[in-house]
């Protein structure tokens, strides 16, 4: 079986999926569902997953949810907020995805793949 995916490849694939979501927004993403905003710092991948996993019935982000689980070392389930230190702001999924995308782009440019 193939070996583990290099971190740079995994991050690149995640960015490409977020680009795909952003580019293909023909209607409000996930019907305008709101999610908790996160701090884009350490533990960001788990925090992002914990926020997005609470969106159900939105096929557009299912692949993103699966990919984020590959970056998060522990299992995440709906209603879990161990990494979300600040739960005071809710934003639309579209804005969440955009913020995450721009942050990951920065990380990629800086060579921070983990």
């Amino acid at each position: 079986s193939p070996g583990p995916v290099p971190p740079s490849t995994a991050l690149r694939e995640l960015i490409e999926e977020l680009v795909n979501i952003t580019q293909n927004q023909k209607a409000p993403l996930c019907n305008g569902s709101m999610v908790w905003s996160i701090n884009l710092t350490a533990g960001m991948y788990c925090a992002a997953l914990e926020s997005l996993i609470n969106v159900s019935g939105c096929s557009a982000i299912e692949k993103t949810q699966r990919m984020l689980s590959g970056f998060c070392p522990h299992k995440v389930s709906a209603g879990q907020f161990s990494s979300l230190h600040v739960r005071d702001t809710k934003i639309e999924v579209a804005q969440f995805v955009k913020d995450l995308l721009l942050h990951l782009k920065k990380l990629f440019r800086e060579g921070r793949f983990n």
Partner: antibody, heavy 122, light 109 residues
Framework: EVQLLESGGGLVQPGGSLRLSCAAS????????MSWVRQAPGKGLEWVSA????????YYADSVKGRFTISRDNSKNTLYLQMNSLRAEDTAVYYC???????????????WGQGTLVTVSS | SYVLTQPPSVSVAPGQTARITCGGN??????VHWYQQKPGQAPVLVVY???DRPSGIPERFSGSNSGNTATLTISRVEAGDEADYYC???????????FGGGTKLTVLG
């Protein structure tokens, strides 16, 4: 140092054809989307066409679709714009521009050539 | 197709703050880039990804984007900032790059 050098502009009659070239250096050409942007005399910027790093995806403004073809030769680090059925309203300075990231067309253009003037007139 | 609306001109005195707006339907959900173009020269990217600055661009240039308006802010304006400024986005519904009509920044005096 990133450099983009356009060539191929000139005077052409309505209905005629021209091929513009953009020679790129100073970066891994195949890793970046590229685009053509034009500017008519005294007017604003108008996007013309874009192409992915591999050349597999191309995009066109409605005003040029079916008349212009964007392509690239990654072995020669060169971007092309084949312009057919030219009209007076195609008269402009044509710039080639490099996307600032490898993925998609969401990104800005971080380097621009100095432009080549295309004049369509009888 | 998607339309970006910029004021044709903005005037500001040296040392003051210039704000150039770019309006578009739900532009806050899009990624906005800003270019400066001086007469006879190619455009230069001054702000990308809503609010990031390329290396070599002074900190006086900043960007923001939310709701239906993106804004390029130039603080402590200098005579050398006089130029045309363009905003740009990618419109996913048409697969087109879209530029605003441009804003001519005039530095008074």
């Amino acid at each position: 140092e990133v450099q983009l050098l356009e060539s191929g502009g000139g005077l052409v009659q309505p209905g005629g054809s021209l091929r513009l070239s953009c020679a790129a250096s100073g970066f891994t050409f195949s890793s970046y989307a590229m685009s053509w942007v034009r500017q008519a005399p005294g007017k604003g910027l108008e996007w013309v066409s874009a192409i992915s790093g591999s050349g597999g995806s191309t995009y066109y403004a409605d005003s040029v679709k079916g008349r212009f073809t964007i392509s690239r030769d990654n072995s020669k680090n060169t971007l092309y714009l084949q312009m057919n059925s030219l009209r007076a309203e195609d008269t402009a300075v044509y710039y080639c521009a490099k996307a600032d990231f490898w993925s998609g067309t969401l990104w800005g253009f971080d380097y621009w050539g100095q432009g080549t003037l295309v004049t369509v007139s009888s | 197709s998607y339309v970006l609306t910029q004021p044709p001109s903005v005037s500001v005195a040296p040392g003051q703050t210039a704000r150039i707006t770019c309006g578009g339907n739900n532009i806050g959900n899009k990624i906005v880039h800003w270019y400066q173009q001086k007469p006879g020269q190619a455009p230069v990217l001054v702000v990308y990804d809503d609010s990031d600055r390329p290396s070599g661009i002074p900190e006086r240039f900043s960007g923001s984007n939310s709701g239906n308006t993106a804004t390029l802010t130039i603080s402590r304006v200098e005579a050398g900032d006089e130029a045309d400024y363009y905003c740009q986005v990618w419109d996913s519904s048409s697969d087109h790059v879209v530029f605003g009509g441009g804003t001519k920044l005039t530095v008074l005096g």
